[in-house]
């Protein structure tokens, strides 16, 4: 026994164009509200066959009122899980169908009006004990996104709930032969022996020497198929009592069944009877194996060897997702250092490292002043991947072997003379002008435009200048 | 509930050319997988090439640089262009599709693709 349990994360506009009209109005507010039907195995049944293993109606959402001339959003849910309990084992595999209803809330006569907005449906593969599932369905121009998950509930355990557990008759450890209950691990598995020769595939056990089967099979021992056909002969008359098909074109002509499925005439259609690993109402479907190749970029695929089992992906450097599907950006890690430039090559990367820089992420800062001498005395240093030279007074040029002139740039103003001196270069001012560099005006009245006189210095001496 | 039609088997003469084509339609999600398969008489089926979604491709060794499996997504067709066909090409060419995070997928009804010599 155990809970299935569907969380709606939002039912709104789908993607693309043709957006849907909301489905409230400020003259008819309204409010939703969810309805889950659940069948066991992966049988396409009509949705108006029973629900089998289950169903359940959400609560009222919100009352919500359109805003006039905007688009649809996301509408108001209905606060919960929507939980299906089931008694017997559960199946695995098993068929859903949500339905997303309106309640319009206007004043019709005889209380509110209920109409289907949309109706989704699938079959999935689901162990009990896993985590929550996410899934999005798109119905019409309609989009619902949302989670399941099936739980066991105690003392049932595994993936079917089909094990017990039992608190410990003795504190330490387990009896003979019996296993800790994980993931109640201060629980021990019950002993449940099935009747001899209960088929292991299709046939279960809750209590001690019983054999109940999984739907489709049949028999004491759940091991004869379930045929639907009441019929001895296939084209047999008409009867109220046996139900059985009108003369005339079978609905098995022409092999509807896909994969090398086998046709069988029932009262109202036909049934296929699959081969192993195929399913669905035509044989039309499958489970994704490591032989439908769903690795990608080399990929390599590790199990799903046979059609109930999942395969996982081993991507390779480079790649990620759940089919090696996705290109890593590796350059937008930024893994070269000291501004190199990241070449993502696919089986490597490269990074073009900045001059006076080397290594394979440009990590090595070279010694730019290595081998390199400045003449005259002047030092070597380093900067930026090249070497630089600073040359000792009256010299210049990339290896200070040039004699500088220092009056080559004018550097006195106002006319002023230079001359070259040992300590550098000295400027005679025209008259009128005074400073290092002739830039200062001597005004007539004494005073001189001189900047703010620092500390102990009058403005206005131009003695202290010179 | 996918439906899966496919188009364009027939009887080629070795050397020659065929374009295969399956339109998916139904529930088909955003992230998904359309490829071809094949099944020669009395021999498994087998991967032809598949493509991603988002454009990651898959071919078997021994169509490598003859078939090129292309798509397109707003329509959900998948394509598949044989060219320098083989003898051993003859097969039933099954059209399959599946849903990332999915446990089971979609098969064609298949089409025939016979090469003479």
């Known amino acids: 026994a155990g809970v299935f349990e569907l969380q709606i994360h939002s039912f709104g506009p789908g993607p693309g164009p043709g957006a849907p009209r909301s489905p409230c109005s400020a003259r008819l507010p309204c409010r939703l509200f969810f309805r889950v039907c659940l069948k066991p195995g992966l049988s396409e049944e009509a949705a108006e066959s029973p629900c089998a293993l289950g169903a359940a109606l959400s609560a009222r959402g919100p009352v919500y009122t359109e805003q006039p001339g905007a688009p649809a959003p996301d509408l108001p849910l209905p606060d919960g899980l929507l939980q299906v309990p089931f008694r017997d084992a559960w199946p695995g595999t098993f068929s859903f169908i949500i339905e997303t209803w309106r309640e319009e809330l206007g004043d019709q006569i005889g209380g509110p009006a209920w109409s289907l907005l949309a109706r989704v449906a699938g079959r999935r593969r689901l162990a009990a004990g896993g985590p929550w599932a996410r899934d999005i369905q798109r119905a019409g121009a309609w989009e619902l996104r949302f989670s399941y998950r099936a739980r066991c509930e105690p003392p049932a355990v595994g993936t079917a709930c089909t094990r017990l557990c039992r608190p410990r008759s003795a504190p330490s450890r387990c009896g003979p032969g019996l296993r800790p209950c994980a993931p109640l691990e201060d629980e021990c598995e019950a002993p449940l022996v099935c009747r001899a020769g209960c088929s292991p595939e299709h046939g279960f056990c809750e209590q001690p020497g019983e054999c109940r089967c999984l739907e489709g099979w049949t028999g004491p021992l759940c091991t004869v198929p379930v045929s639907t056909s009441s019929c001895l002969s296939p084209r047999g008359p008409s009867s109220a009592t046996t139900g059985c098909l009108v003369p005339g074109p079978g609905p098995c002509d022409g092999n509807p069944c896909a994969n090398g499925g086998s046709c069988s005439e029932t009262p109202r259609s036909f049934e296929c009877t699959c081969p192993r690993g195929f399913y669905g109402l035509r044989c039309e479907v499958s489970g994704v194996t490591c032989a439908d190749g769903p690795c990608f970029n080399g990929g390599l695929c590790v199990g799903g060897a046979d059609p109930d089992s999942a395969y996982i992906c081993h991507c390779p450097p480079g790649f990620q997702g759940s089919n090696c599907e996705k290109r890593v950006d590796r350059c937008s890690l930024q893994p070269c250092r000291n501004g190199g430039l990241c070449l993502d090559l696919g089986h490597a990367l490269r990074c073009r490292c900045r001059a006076g820089f080397a290594g394979p992420r440009c990590e090595h800062d070279l010694d730019d002043c290595a081998g390199r001498a400045c003449a005259n005395g002047g030092t070597c240093v380093e900067g930026g991947g090249a070497h630089r030279c600073s040359c000792a007074l009256g010299f210049g040029g990339r290896d200070c072997r040039e004699r500088a002139d220092p009056c080559a740039a004018r550097p006195c103003a106002h006319g002023g003379r230079c001359y070259a001196h040992f300590s550098g270069l000295v400027c005679a001012c025209a008259p009128g002008y005074m400073g290092a560099r002739c830039e200062f005006p001597v005004h007539p009245d004494g005073a001189s435009a001189l900047p703010a006189a620092p500390p102990g210095l009058r403005p206005g001496d131009p003695q202290r200048y010179l | 509930q996918v439906q899966l039609q496919e188009s364009g088997g027939g009887l080629v003469q070795a050397g020659g050319s065929l374009r295969l084509s399956c339109a998916a339609s139904?529930?088909?999600?955003?992230?998904?997988?359309m490829g071809w398969h094949r099944q020669a008489p009395g021999k498994q089926r087998e991967l032809v090439a598949n493509?991603?979604?988002?454009?990651?491709?898959n071919y078997a060794d021994s169509v490598k640089g003859r078939f090129t499996i292309s798509r397109d997504n707003a329509k959900n067709i998948v394509y598949l262009q044989m060219n320098n066909l083989k003898i051993e090409d003859t097969a039933v060419y099954y059209c399959?599709?599946?849903?990332?995070?999915?446990?089971?997928?979609?098969w064609g009804q298949g089409t025939q693709v016979t090469v003479s010599s």
């Open positions: 139904g529930s088909t999600f955003t992230s998904n997988v």
């Open positions: 399959r599709w599946y849903g990332i995070q999915r446990a089971e997928g979609y």
């Open positions: 493509m991603h979604s988002g454009g990651s491709t």
